[in-house]
Structure formats: C-alpha cells, structure tokens
Amino acid sequence: EAHKSEIAHRFKDLGEQHFKGLVLIAFSQYLQKCPYEEHIKLVQEVTDFAKTCVADENAENCDKSIHTLFGDKLCAIPKLRDNYGELADCCAKQEPERNECFLQHKDDNPNLPPFQRPEAEAMCTSFQENPTSFLGHYLHEVARRHPYFYAPELLYYAEKYNEVLTQCCTESDKAACLTPKLDAVKEKALVAAVRQRMKCSSMQRFGERAFKAWAVARMSQRFPNAEFAEITKLATDVTKINKECCHGDLLECADDRAELAKYMCENQATISSKLQACCDKPVLQKSQCLAEIEHDNIPADLPSIAADFVEDKEVCKNYAEAKDVFLGTFLYEYSRRHPDYSVSLLLRLAKKYEATLEKCCAEGDPPACYGTVLAEFQPLVEEPKNLVKTNCELYEKLGEYGFQNAVLVRYTQKAPQVSTPTLVEAARNLGRVGTKCCTLPEAQRLPCVEDYLSAILNRLCVLHEKTPVSEKVTKCCSGSLVERRPCFSALTVDETYVPKEFKAETFTFHSDICTLPDKEKQIKKQTALAELVKHKPKATEDQLKTVMGDFAQFVDKCCKAADKDNCFATEGPNLVARSKEALA
C-alpha cells in the first residue's frame, strides 16, 4: 500500500538501530572513499529527518522518495568531484537516472588497504568504550570494500561480531577467544559477499526472470513438500528483495526480507517442517536462519519425472499454453527430487529441456523427438560429478595450500594476461573449495562445489570486466551465468600468449618476508608462482615443483640466518640463476 512518507514508513518498520545501520551501509557502498566520520554525520542527519517525518508525515520533503533524499545528501558533500571524479556527474541527473548512475560507479575492487584487525586488547578497549561506534566502523569498512554486500545480512554479521566481542572481552586471554571466532565470522562474510555479488550480476545482466529461475530451483531443493505455487510465491518475493538490495534500495530490501520471514513462519505447514527453530529467533537471526535452513525430507511417493514431462501426450499443448509455468513446474519437480545437484546444473537441465521442446514441438512426431530428453541429461550431470571427484581427490592429496597452487598454475595457463594479483586472489578462493566442500557427505559435495566455484568465477568476471585483457575470459564471462563454470573448466593453455620476459626483480626477495603472517607469506610465494607460469606457460609440473621447492628452502634458510639481509642479497641471485636453468 502507498504511504505518504516512504522514509517514515521504513523508519517505523525497521526501528532506529537497523534504520541507521542500513543508511550507513548504503552511503558506504555508494561513496566508498569517504571516511567513517563523514558518513556517520550524514546518517545522523537522515535519521533526524526521518524522525521529523514520523512525527508529521506532511512535513516538508517527507513525501520525497528515499533515492531522492539519499541522492541529495550525497550530492551535497563538499569536494565530491575532487574525491570521486566523474561520479559527481551523476548529481546533474534526475531520479531514477541519478541512482542508476551511482550504481554504475560502484567499484568492486576499491583502492583501499586490506582491513586490518586490531590487537585483541585494543579492540576490546574501543568496543567497550563505544560499542555503537565500533560496530558502525565494522559496517562501514565491510560495506565500502563490498559495495554489493547484502545489507540485512551485513547487519546480522555485525550482530555476530558484537556477540563475540561481548563474550571474549571479559576473558583473560582475549586473543585466544577472539581470533578463531572472528575468523569464522570473517570467512562466512567473505563467502556471503561473493555469493551476493553473483546474485546482483545475475539480476543486472540477465534480469529478473533468470534470477527467479535460480530461486525456484533453490527453494524447491529446500522445501520439496511445498507446492509449486508456494515455491513460486517465495521465489517471486526473494527476487524482489534481491532486486531491491542490488539496486541500492536497502531500507525496502531489509523491510521486505523481514516480511518474508514473517510470512514463512506463519505458513510453515505449507512450506517446510524444518522452520520452527528459526521462527523463535529475533528478526535478523530469523531471516539468516531461514536462508541457511537444511533441506526438508523429500516426499516418499514422488512419481517419476517422466510421467508429466515426457510420457504425457499433452506435453506440447501444456508447454504452449503457458511456457513459463510449464518450464517452472519442470524445474520445481526436478529440483525437489535432486538436493544433490547444484542449482547451476539444475538450470542447465531446464535449459536443455526447454530447447528440446522448442525443437520437438515444431516437428511432426513430438513425442518421438522429446522421448529421449532425460537420457540426454546424462553427460550434463556427469561433467560436474567428474569435476568434483578429480578436484576433491587432488585436494585430499595436496592440502589447501598445495591445491591452491595447482589451481593457480591451471588458471594462469588458461588466462596468463590477467593480472597476477587477480589470479592469486581467484586461485586462493577457488582453492578453498576443497576445505569448504570436499569434507562434506557425498550428497552435498556437488552443490557445494559448483555453486561456490560459480560465485568465485563471477568475481573474476567482474574484476576482468573493469580491465578486459583476455579474450578467453571475456568469452566465458559474456555467456550465460550457468555455463560459466563449465566454460572456464574447458579452457586449456592459451597458445596465443607470448611469454613474459624473465625479470630478476620479480623473483627478488628481502628479509621483510620473514616477519609476514603465514597468509601474506603464502601470497608472496603464489605471486612468484604465477609469474613463473607467465614466463614459462608450458613448464611441467615437475619443473615448477623444483623451482618452488627451491624457493621455499631459500626463504626458510635466510629467515633463520643470523644476517638475514645479507643472506637474501647473496643467495637471491643464485636462486634466480638456478630457477632460470631449471625452466630452460
């Protein structure tokens, strides 16, 4: 229903705390370079204004859209052009073009230093002195680095952060308590960031229909006892919510997400038997819990999928009457039977089924033509199953770091033109799939592996789109979202690539490497590995192993030496010479 004042409506629905958090996230995602202090000032101004509208919905400007109000605030920032260049041009536009312009200027790889976690003691001191400000900084720092982070979910992670600090800051060994807990929150949040970016990419590039298909498949897997109309209702709502968040309508998105959680909890009987535990929680936790809910048990008496979609003589008639509904019911029926498949695979199968009907329903004997369609699914199913098998075997053999290195070599050979930092980031993330998925029960591996890889490859595509350098990457990224992962998997060594010259400085290291945390040390080594492959794209596994082993020994030896600097200075050139020789 229409409200006189949109901002008053959202403030009342969300409450002051969540309202302020969401406004802070919105501003931080739009203007990623502004300091926290500047954003928090704007947040307070918007909040004060919202309160005046709550008191009197007819007050001046209260009838303006939230985009108009937020945009006016952002455009009033002094020195906007100095700090943001052409983003300031957006301010000359009217809504809705102005908001579209802001969205187009979101930077997926902002030039910001990696977020450094302070020492445990310092963290606890600043948290205890001002928890609101401390958590505000957290929202700001995450949101500006991840401009598409799902805002209501970020509020949830801030709440988790708060819980961990509240608990650990009273312990004697604060660091021992904080480190593993905050690492777990960080890991979950980073995965959430790439997953949401994929959803926004899907929405931006392929529209609501594609996203809704994704949602139907996912919901059908989770809620196999719900009817098709119920699944479609949930998928429609989830599509709307994600469209809002991806579009910067964070208040509406969070409000609608809370509404959906309420609806699901009021209609458990028609959705799933697994919801009750989630429904007893407060709003942010409730929504998050519902988003992560385990699959309901598949009904025991489901008939074969062939009955309605292959053997029925009316298939073409049913398809013609309402293509989207018929294909939707196919996707629903197939997905509810296959929680062991990835959503990407289910969408590939639905696409294959649609293409088969398009072809066969125009022919003389449609049933004979589409009669083999389910058998034709087999190669599509086998391909990702083999991918999971081979990659999990490799992961089990090499461990996470070794597996990341294998992936890094593979991807540097596929796309050597891509910048080394991007390749290292992608390979490290792709390599984590082993730890994340290969330890799961067999039935959960495929959906975990493929849907995670798809999200990571989307990040690679988003970064590559900014500065396209590889035709092969462009080709895989331009196609359909569900075909991306198979496209990347099928890439081989890029034969057109002219190897990089060997530059000694690329492989010159200093004693500062010794004091780096393990993660940073790994990144240094992986950077060297990618550069080696760019120099020798056809180097054998044994050659690379020799050089990297030699390199690891060299670092180890010099870091243990009494005069580290001298060791690096004298041993370094020898290492470079040996490496060149080994790769010759």
Epitope: F228, A229, T236, T329
Partner: nanobody, 117 residues
C-alpha cells in the same frame, strides 16, 4: 459446490480498459492460488495470470505484462483482472480458474472481451 462467476466483459475500443471480476464460492478462497485463462476465437488456451493466496502475483503471460494487473480481495472472495491498453489480439473469452497443486481444477463459464473499433 465450487462456483466461479465472471463478469465485466464487453466491447471496448483499442487502447481502452476493462476490469473483470470473478466471484468465488463453495471453497475457502484464501487457501487457493487463482488465475485467469483466455481463449481467442479459433485458438488454443492461453494462461494470462496467476495470483497466490497472499496476493503475490506469480505469473503474467509475456503478451500482457505491463498492461494487465491481477489482484484479489480475500475478504470478498473475489478475483480481479484490470486490463489496460487493450489490443485487438486481446479479444477472447476470459475464464477465471482455481489452481490446485499442478493445474486448474475448476473453471468459470467465461466472459467475452471484444476489442474493436
């Protein structure tokens, strides 16, 4: 017994508007997804739209998107179809139907909509 009674059809000029209504009885209306289906002269059935009991629209045919709006009033057991920017190709008998699980199980008698100048 289940009854669905459509009304609101008639003759309208291209570009004009009509609002169809469907009065439902004999079942718990707010438990069912409802829809509109049409059949143009000499053609097969075409599903126009579906609406979930909660009021969430879950389907529009591409041919009517942006022009037709389905809605329902559960307190009045009534389904509506607001049709704007009507075209000659929208000429058809419009049926109100109840959706059950996988298909429509009850239909009304239909109301004729003719778009012509």
């Amino acid at each position: 017994e289940v009854q669905l009674l459509e009304s609101g059809g008639g003759l309208v000029q291209p570009g004009g508007s009509l609002r169809l209504s469907c009065a439902a009885s004999g079942f718990t209306f707010n438990h069912y997804t409802m829809g509109w289906v049409r059949q143009a002269p000499g053609k097969g059935l075409e599903w126009v739209s579906l609406i979930h009991p909660s009021g969430t629209v879950i389907y529009y045919a591409d041919s009517v998107k942006g022009r037709f709006t389905i809605s329902r009033d559960n307190s009045k057991n009534t389904l509506y179809l607001q049709m704007n920017s009507l075209r000659a190709e929208d000429t058809a008998v419009y049926y109100c139907a109840r959706w059950s699980s996988r298909a429509f199980d009850y239909w009304g008698q239909g109301t004729l909509v003719t778009v012509s100048s």
